[in-house]
């Protein structure tokens, strides 16, 4: 376990070779979650990346939030994508934390503190709990079959995730640098291991 | 075994409209997004659009926006495209595909249009 507070990993060109696995302690099925992080590339106006990739051996789309070109957010929870527009992309870290719950299907999604449009998926769903959980690739089988196309260019950090839906307070209370305890996956508790050329360097937001 | 099968080929008159059909089956069809793709001779793949057959919702790219309606049916696991105000830049092969905007894993045989008067 390494504490990363105030850290970031750094992917710093194109490769289909280079990603971060994070290792989770889950027992069970999720019938909910949230995801938290920051991340900064140059991208975003050039062409799609991965921002987050779970995936388990059933399927390799269990959850991923992907920026897509010309249309913003990707989100997918067990092969089923919604998509939050974003018309205009600006280069700065941005901070994301997505939910979902599986009894209503209801997703969130905040991008900076500001939330969207709440929209639904896979009401009823449950996500898988073997689950290999990538950053800086978009797993098309489990734990690889990477494109280069799709790899993260830049810093990504503040990964946090639990096993239910925060409340809009909390996940205010994040954005602004507030105390909380994640329960999946723990940035300043991160189990982790680096394959290729990322870096860990102090993070850039503040 | 995973099947998309599209609808055959339609030759129309410009300024008429076309409903082309994709019928999913060998698996639940409101697990995956259908997705609608554009391919003119000797041009790359052009994205139209997708539904979601769970949740109804649409989207459709810029390009697309009042030129294709997309809909389904979950009762006959089938997706529809309409396209409205066929001009002759509108002949081309359209695809379905079942997936998301990251990948799509299953993709129909085409359906041929050819706008002529």
């Known amino acids: 376990q390494t504490d990363m507070s105030r850290k970031a990993f750094v992917f710093p060109k194109e490769s289909d070779t280079s990603y971060v696995s994070l290792k989770a302690p889950l027992t069970k099925p999720l019938k909910a979650f949230t995801v938290c992080l920051h991340f900064y590339t140059e991208l975003s106006s050039t062409r799609g990346y991965s921002i987050f990739s779970y995936a388990t051996k059933r399927q390799d789309n269990e959850i991923l939030i992907f920026w897509s070109k010309d249309i913003g957010y990707s989100f997918t929870v067990g092969g089923s994508e919604i998509l939050f527009e974003v018309p205009e992309v600006t280069v700065a870290p941005v901070h994301i934390c997505t939910s979902w719950e599986s009894a209503s299907g209801i997703v969130e999604f905040w991008v900076d503190g500001k939330p969207r449009v709440r929209k639904s998926l896979k009401k009823g769903y449950t996500v898988g709990a073997e689950a290999s959980i990538i950053l800086g690739q978009e797993q098309d089988s489990f734990g690889g079959n990477f494109e280069g196309s799709q790899s993260l260019v830049g810093d990504i950090g503040n990964v946090n995730m639990w096993d239910f839906v925060l409340s809009p307070d909390e996940i205010n209370t994040i954005y602004l640098g507030g105390p909380f305890s994640p329960n999946v996956l723990n940035w300043r508790a991160l189990k982790y291991e680096v394959q290729g050329e990322v870096f860990t360097k102090p993070q850039l937001w503040p | 075994e995973v099947q998309l099968q599209q609808s055959g080929p339609e030759v129309l008159k410009p300024g008429t409209s076309v409903r082309m059909s994709c019928k999913a089956s060998g698996y639940t069809f409101t697990d995956y997004n259908i997705h609608w793709v554009k391919q003119s001779r000797g041009e790359s793949l052009e994205w139209i659009g997708f539904v979601n057959p769970d949740t109804g919702d649409t989207y459709y790219y810029k390009n697309f926006k009042g030129k294709a309606t997309l809909t389904f049916n979950r009762s006959s696991s089938t997706a529809y495209m309409d396209l409205r105000s066929l001009t002759s830049e509108d002949s081309a092969v359209y695809y379905c595909?079942?997936?998301?905007?990251?990948?799509?894993?299953?993709w129909g045989q085409g359906t041929i249009l050819t706008v002529s008067s």
């Open positions: 595909a079942r997936g998301t905007t990251v990948e799509k894993d299953y």
